[in-house]
């Protein structure tokens, strides 16, 4: 007897982090035997939508015309073949930016830092928030994800980098959010260019050793794992 149907692949274009008001297309790719595709959204009546496959029948398209809070969340898709329904896809977490006003990102003591020294990136919001994310341009994942303990609201989060190496150089933005929805983020802060001068190369920068320099959209899940305590906020990095 044949085993379970292979799970489909689910992804979003142009990515899974979408600004308010922009369109997004969700794709579900199964097999050539697929007769129907179904998309489910967590905490919504199932199915969210059903689509016939597009030729050559191995994928289907689900569309969002203008991103709003209601579309943010976790999605899974399935396909039906002559032998039944597939396993669910891995989840797609669709995140909306623009839900809150943009925070301010600054570098202390300065965005111009000598290799081997320390710098702290400070993300400040006008209204109290409980989650802050620091994003580096062209990194596939958020660098750091700070969440306050016990839902305490804070106006800022500090992202210390020490010792700084050339890897830390680049363009950063930060977002703020409320814990009741991980899928709703603020507008991005204005970009901050961190310039590292000098040639000292420290082998293990911390805590941002996970910084990815791979090119690509910021379309990965925004929920990193692991934590250490930090000034009332929990620090997460990958």
């Amino acid at each position: 007897q044949a085993g379970p149907l292979p799970k489909p692949t689910l992804w979003a274009e142009p990515g899974s982090v979408i600004s308010w008001g922009n369109s997004v297309t969700i794709w579900c790719q199964g097999t050539l035997e697929a007769r129907e595709y179904r998309l489910d959204k967590e905490e919504s009546p199932a199915p969210w939508d059903r689509q016939n496959p597009l030729e050559p029948k191995n994928k289907a398209r689900f569309s969002i015309p203008s991103m709003t809070e209601d579309y943010a969340g976790r999605y899974r898709c399935y396909y039906r073949s002559p032998v039944g329904w597939s396993q669910p896809s891995d989840p797609l977490e669709l995140v909306m930016t623009g839900a809150y006003s943009k925070p301010t990102l600054s570098a202390l003591p300065s965005p111009l830092v000598t290799s081997g020294k320390s710098v702290t990136l400070l993300c400040q919001s006008r209204s109290p928030m409980d989650t802050f994310l620091l994003i580096k341009e062209r990194a596939a994942h958020p660098l750091l994800h700070l969440r306050s303990e016990h839902g305490a609201q804070q106006h800022q989060a500090e992202f210390p980098m020490s010792p700084v190496t050339s890897v830390h150089g680049g363009t950063y933005r930060c977002f703020s959010s409320h814990g009741f929805s991980h899928y709703l983020l603020s507008h991005p802060s204005d970009p901050l260019e961190l310039i590292v001068s000098g040639s000292l190369e420290d082998p293990r920068p911390s805590p941002t050793r996970s910084v990815s320099t791979a090119a690509g959209p910021e379309d990965q899940p925004l929920m990193p794992t692991g934590s250490v305590p930090h000034s009332g906020l929990r620090r997460h990095w990958e």
């Epitope: 369109s23 203008s66 579309y71």
Partner: antibody, heavy 121, light 108 residues
Framework: EQSVEESGGDLVKPGASLTLTCAAS?????????MCWVRQAPGKGLEWIAC????????RWYASWPKGRFTISKTSSTTVTLQMTSLTAADTATYFC?????????????WGPGTLVTISS | ELVMTQTPASVEAVVGGTVTIKCQAS??????LAWYQQKPGQRPKLLIY???TLASGVPSRFSGSGSGTEFTLTVSDLECADVAAYYC??????????FGGGTEVVVK
């Protein structure tokens, strides 16, 4: 053949309410469509009123000018309504139902013939 | 609130000539712009979507260009059949499907 057709247009008095219906033929609503209402006063231009997503009834988009007097709803997988309240002479127009389509980057690719609404005492 | 401003309100041209219609969005809408043609007594017809892509069956005499906030519709080799009102529209960007005020094209 895919088509949409409006119904419910009438002559009513100022202050009255009216519900227009848009019936789709040859297709049913899905996430790849929005259904929209557009109106055109005699001798005037097109004026967008509202759109609703084919699957997500929470997602309705309105122009700012009706100020809550108009409500778009999906009543089945092939019908959409526009409820209009506190009507005035300025609401006299031909009301079109149109389909916004992801294949056309959400342009309005399919239009009904329109239904005439006249507000007069 | 996003506003679409269309110019001119009316344009007169000769058969075989060229007409250019401008459309300006009050904020950037990327390429989410559509153009429509409406002949007297008829329903509107989609001409161009995604700022420059011709809808099926539309003659290549029609062309669209632009992105962000500035867009243009050009009708070349004008024919009598092109006498109509033309409208630009933001197609869903920033949660609006707002139209421009329209341009009447008449043939001399």
């Amino acid at each position: 053949e895919q088509s949409v057709e409006e119904s419910g247009g009438d002559l009513v008095k100022p202050g009255a309410s009216l519900t227009l219906t848009c019936a789709a033929s040859g297709f049913s609503f899905s996430s790849t469509y929005c259904m929209c209402w557009v109106r055109q006063a005699p001798g005037k231009g097109l004026e967008w009123i509202a759109c609703i997503h084919g699957v997500s009834t929470n997602n309705r988009w309105y122009a700012s000018w009706p100020k809550g007097r108009f409500t778009i709803s999906k009543t089945s997988s092939t019908t959409v309504t526009l409820q209009m309240t506190s009507l005035t002479a300025a609401d006299t127009a031909t009301y079109f139902c149109a389909r916004s389509d992801t294949d056309y980057e959400w342009g309005l690719s399919l239009w009904g013939p329109g239904t005439l609404v006249t507000i007069s005492s | 609130e996003l506003v679409m401003t269309q110019t001119p309100a009316s344009v007169e041209a000769v058969v075989g000539g060229t007409v250019t219609i401008k459309c300006q969005a009050s904020e950037s809408i990327g390429s989410r712009l559509a153009w429509y043609q409406q002949k007297p007594g008829q329903r509107p017809k989609l001409l161009i979507y995604k700022a420059s892509t011709l809808a099926s069956g539309v003659p290549s005499r029609f062309s669209g260009s632009g992105s962000g906030t500035e867009f243009t519709l050009t009708v070349s080799d004008l024919e009598c059949a092109d006498v109509a009102a033309y409208y630009c529209q933001c197609a869903g960007q920033s949660s609006t499907w707002a139209f421009g005020g329209g341009t009447e094209v008449v043939v001399k």
